[in-house]
């Protein structure tokens, strides 16, 4: 039975040209995390596998950094980075848990004036 829950940073905004940390946390389960995927709806950004370590997609190699922890740092943000990001926790014996983060990348002047969801 899957008892765990994924906590995420939820809806976040960041400045164009800046960076953001995408972070999820799996709680309420003793299941072992064996792999975490970071994905958009149409493509994979990165995988952190307990045995193989980190894999970063070539499409994001120049501006994605692994971590902190199982999170992902997205750098040199553009407005095209606006959208939904999924953290997919592969666990044993529970199975797969999915969390989501919506990122809005704002023009600098807008971000400076404290845009909020």
């Amino acid at each position: 039975m899957m008892t765990g829950t994924i906590e995420t940073t939820g809806n976040i905004s960041a400045e164009k040209g800046g960076s953001i940390i995408l972070q999820c946390h799996l709680s309420s389960t003793t299941a072992q995390v064996t792999q975490v995927n970071w994905e958009q709806q149409d493509q994979l950004l990165a995988i952190c596998n307990a045995d193989l370590g980190w894999h970063i997609s070539p499409s994001f190699k120049d501006r994605v950094a692994p971590g902190p922890g199982l999170g992902l740092t997205l750098q040199s943000l553009t407005v095209n980075d606006t959208g939904e990001y999924f953290c997919i926790y592969h666990t044993y014996p529970d199975g797969t848990y999915t969390g989501r983060i919506f990122l809005e990348v704002l023009e600098s002047s807008v971000a400076e004036h404290g845009a909020r969801f």
Epitope: N37, E39, Q41, L44, I47, L52, I88, H90
Partner: antibody, heavy 118, light 107 residues
Framework: DVQLQESGPGLVKPSQTLSLTCTVT?????????WNWIRQPPGKGLEWMGY???????RYNPSLKSRITISRDTSKNQFSLKLSSVTAEDTATYYC???????????WGQGTLVTVSS | DIQMTQSPSSLSASVGDRVTITCRAS??????VAWYQQKPGQAPRLLIY???YRYTGVPDRFSGSGSGTDFTLTISSLQAEDVAVYYC?????????FGQGTKLEIK
């Protein structure tokens, strides 16, 4: 339980537009996931055609991009495929399927055979 | 597009045999590979995702392994009901592509 069911004409004439609908029961197509079309010509392999996500954005296989449109009718919990300018090469069993996280296909319709012939 | 190449295209084995099907991706897809079983007249059925994770309800005689470009589906002890065509699929990015299939028969 989630169920998907394809419907539409089994015979389409060359140069016309193929239109199919997938009716989803047991889950709202606006709640989550991406809703896909995958086809399989007789005796051949599988080809991913495209999807419409729960938020309404579509993504297509570049090999079909100029001919394909996937849309949805949220009031009926249906999504649809339109493929224009069909030829005999488009004869296939067409499946609708739900994409999971990660992007595997765990739920499929039973498939519907569409023959392109005059 | 990422191409997926399966081998063999067909194979015949006896009940109880250990069967291995391989799939090679044209570029590094890390562990983003799924395996399906398709029986005649039916839709494909998901067996394995993320290279080695068995989907809910799939018998434990099915296992997957591999990373990067080389992947394997193994049936540890072949059963009569495993006669089917098996497909690999990468789930790395769109367009998702499938291998050409491996037809498995019983000797």
């Amino acid at each position: 339980d989630v169920q998907l069911q394809e419907s539409g004409p089994g015979l389409v004439k060359p140069s016309q537009t193929l239109s199919l609908t997938c009716t989803v029961t047991g889950y709202s197509i606006t709640s989550d996931y991406a809703w896909n079309w995958i086809r399989q010509p007789p005796g051949k392999g599988l080809e991913w055609m495209g999807y419409i996500s729960y938020s309404g954005s579509a993504r297509y296989n570049p090999s079909l991009k100029s001919r394909i449109t996937i849309s949805r009718d949220t009031s009926k919990n249906q999504f649809s495929l339109k493929l224009s300018s069909v030829t005999a090469e488009d004869t296939a069993t067409y499946y609708c399927a739900r994409k999971g996280y990660p992007a595997y296909f765990a739920y499929w319709g039973q498939g519907t055979l569409v023959t392109v012939s005059s | 597009d990422i191409q997926m190449t399966q081998s063999p295209s067909s194979l015949s084995a006896s009940v109880g045999d250990r069967v291995t099907i391989t799939c090679r991706a044209s570029q590094d897809v890390s562990t983003a590979v799924a395996w399906y079983q398709q029986k005649p007249g039916q839709a494909p059925r998901l067996l394995i995702y993320s290279a080695s994770y068995r989907y809910t309800g799939v018998p434990d005689r099915f296992s997957g392994s591999g990373s990067g470009t080389d992947f394997t589906l193994t049936i540890s002890s072949l059963q009569a009901e495993d006669v089917a065509v098996y497909y690999c699929q990468h789930h790395y990015s769109t367009p998702y592509t499938f291998g050409q299939g491996t037809k498995l028969e019983i000797k």
